[in-house]
């Protein structure tokens, strides 16, 4: 079964600065990648990042900048300051979207007491759903 | 909730070309596409085409490929649905549906406009 | 001629359970998820199951799909007089690189 993994990062030289990595560990050609916070896509959460991977990607604030690391990783860098900021204990989720297979969502926060700069490594995540 | 409301039915001449609207309401676009289906009347649902709003991909039946254009402004939350070439055989309800097939990878429909009948006649 | 096939009509009597087949090939239900529409007359259909087997929330559990092979099928038990409708079954297929639908069932509640 396909899984999704999710690694977030508080940047070290801005302490309000955060990086959402996810990787999609599977066979299927991905079609869409979706980025939210707060909960999953649909179910509450609110969308950060959509990557499309012929099409590009449209982002919305605080999403500073979302790009492709790989064919199946992304990562999205989240500008720190004002209302919308993210902060520590706030729930970032993944969905990988493989047309006509389904999707692949997992979530992830900052690790506990972690110190800025460092992270969990990039484990897979609980699934969430699989459509 | 999200309410996708139709434009009103029309009656068009063989040969001229038709365009139905379909307007996204309580929710944006997102990442979520906009199919079109159609059903003649006494008749099953068929499957036109579909777009993906967000970055403007479609995707049309084979059967239809050539003869319709769908579209969508992204700012108002709209899609458009245009049929050229018109005969009798398309007098049929037109519906809009939400699908999630570029979200969720599935070609699924979870919400329906209302419906727009469109008459060919001469 | 519709790719996918069900019966024109299926009835039953209240209280009973009726099951609407659906068979379609190798290059749709045989690798894709299905998904089933309920038509109530005069309106627009609504999902009543997608993914095979599952129910958008709302739905009562009176509605179960399965899916087996290149044949799927949905279940309405416990009938009533508000099911009757038109039920279409739909999935993705490869060859035609669309979406299909059966040709919909009519189901009526008898007395």
């Known amino acids: 079964t396909p899984e999704v993994w999710v690694q977030v990062r508080m940047e070290a030289t801005e302490l309000s600065s955060f990086t959402i990595r996810c990787g999609f560990l599977g066979s299927g050609s991905i079609s869409l990648v979706t980025v939210s916070w707060g909960g999953p896509n649909g179910a509450g959460g609110t969308t950060l990042a959509v990557l499309h991977p012929e099409r590009g990607i449209r982002q919305w604030a605080p999403a500073r900048q979302a790009r492709w690391e790989t064919q199946s990783s992304i990562s999205l860098i989240l500008e720190g300051s004002g209302a919308s900021s993210p902060c520590a204990n706030t729930t970032f989720c993944c969905k990988f979207a493989s047309f006509p297979e389904g999707s692949w969502e997992a979530c992830g926060s900052l690790p506990p007491s972690s110190d800025p700069g460092l992270s969990a490594p990039p484990t897979p995540a609980p699934i969430l759903r699989a459509d | 909730q999200v309410q996708l409301v139709q434009s009103g039915a029309e009656v068009k001449k063989p040969g001229s070309s038709v365009k139905v609207s379909c307007k996204a309401s309580?929710?944006?676009?997102?990442?979520?596409?906009i199919s079109w289906v159609r059903q003649a009347p006494g008749k099953g649902l068929e499957w036109m085409g579909q777009?993906?709003?967000?970055?403007?991909?479609?995707k049309y039946a084979q059967k239809f490929q050539g003869r319709v254009t769908i579209a969508a402004d992204e700012p108002t939350s709209t899609a458009y649905m245009e049929l050229g070439s018109l005969r009798s055989e398309d007098t049929a309800i037109y519906y809009c549906a939400r699908d999630r097939m570029a979200a969720d990878g599935m070609a699924v429909f979870d919400y329906w406009g209302q419906g727009t009948l469109v008459t060919v006649s001469s | 001629q519709s790719v996918l096939t069900q019966p024109p009509s299926v009835s039953g009597t209240p209280g009973q359970k009726v099951i609407i087949s659906c068979s379609g090939s190798?290059?749709?239900?045989?690798?894709?998820?299905v998904f089933w529409y309920q038509q109530l007359p005069g309106t627009a259909p609504k999902l009543l199951i997608y993914?095979?087997?599952e129910r958008p929330s709302g739905v009562p559990d009176r509605f179960s799909g399965s899916k087996s092979g290149t044949s799927a099928s949905l279940a309405v038990s416990g009938l009533r007089s508000e099911d009757e409708a038109d039920y279409y079954c739909s999935s993705w297929d490869a060859a035609l690189n669309g979406v299909v639908f059966g040709g919909g069932t009519k189901l009526t509640v008898l007395g």
């Open positions: 993914k095979n087997d």
């Open positions: 190798s290059s749709n239900i045989g690798r894709h998820f």
């Open positions: 309580g929710g944006t676009f997102n990442n979520y596409g």
């Open positions: 777009i993906i709003p967000l970055f403007g991909t479609t």
